[in-house]
Amino acid sequence: LTCLGGFASPGPVPPSTALRELIEELVNITQNQKAPLCNGSMVWSINLTAGMYCAALESLINVSGCSAIEKTQRMLSGFCPHKVSAGQFSSLHVRDTKIEVAQFVKDLLLHLKKLFREGQFN
C-alpha cells in the first residue's frame, strides 16, 4: 500500500488543462473589469512567437500593486521554464512599444483561444 500511495498523489497538470485554466482566468479578468485594469498601467508589447509565455510574464511582472493580475502572473510562470524577475527585458518584447494592461490581457486571451483551438498547448 505504501508503494501504491504514489498513484493517488496528483501528477503534473496536463498542458491542455493549464492553458484552459489560464484562458478562464483571463476571461474572468476581462469580464469583471470595472475600473481601468491596474489603473491603466502600460506594459511592453510582445511578439507572439516561441517564448511568448515568458515574454508575457516579463511584461506583466513589472506591474506592481495590481491584485487583479497576480493569479495570471503565477499561472504564466508555470509556462515559463526560467525564473522571471521584474526589470528583465526579453528579445521578444517590442522595444519602445507599450500598450495598456487591459488591452494586453484582452489580446493575449484572443491569441491563447486560437492556440487552444489549434491544439498548441505549450
Epitope: L48, I99, Q103, D107, L108, L110, H111
Partner: nanobody
Framework: GVQLLESGGGLVQPGGSLRLSCAAS????????MGWVRQAPGKGLEWVSS????????YYADSVKGRFTISRDNSKNTLYLQMNSLRAEDTAVYYC???????????WGQGTLVTVSS
C-alpha cells in the same frame, strides 16, 4: 489606445499598381486576423481581403482575386495590400480593420483614398 493607420493611397492610371500599408499600434497585432474593406463613392462597404494571424491563410473577394495580394509582417505590426492591374471600379477609400468574430475586438483605421483614373 488602439490605432490603425493606413497609407499608400493616391492617384494611379488604369493598369497601374499601388501598395497600401496599415501600421498598427496599441494592440498585440499578431493575435489578430486582419483585413481590408473598401467603400466606393456613393456605395456601401465592400470586403476586399483578409488574412489569418499567422499569415498562412488568405481570402479574397472575387472582384480582386488574382490582382490583389494581402500580406502582413508581425514583427513590424504592419498589414499590406498589393494592388495590381487596377481598374476604375477599384476607386474607393480603403480601410484596414481587424477581422475577428468575437465582440470587443473590432478596430478600424481612418482609411486611405485610392483613385484609378486616366
Amino acid at each position: 489606445g488602439v490605432q490603425l493607420l493606413e497609407s499608400g493611397g493616391g492617384l494611379v492610371q488604369p493598369g497601374g499598381s499601388l501598395r497600401l500599408s496599415c501600421a498598427a499600434s496599441g494592440l498585440l497585432f499578431a493575435a489578430y486576423d486582419m483585413g481590408w474593406v473598401r467603400q466606393a463613392p456613393g456605395k456601401g462597404l465592400e470586403w476586399v481581403s483578409s488574412i489569418d494571424w499567422k499569415g498562412g491563410k488568405t481570402y479574397y473577394a472575387d472582384s480582386v482575386k488574382g490582382r490583389f495580394t494581402i500580406s502582413r509582417d508581425n514583427s513590424k505590426n504592419t498589414l499590406y495590400l498589393q494592388m495590381n492591374s487596377l481598374r476604375a471600379e477599384d476607386t474607393a477609400v480603403y480601410y484596414c480593420a481587424t477581422a475577428e468574430d468575437e465582440p470587443g475586438y473590432d478596430y478600424w483605421g481612418q482609411g486611405t483614398l485610392v483613385t484609378v483614373s486616366s
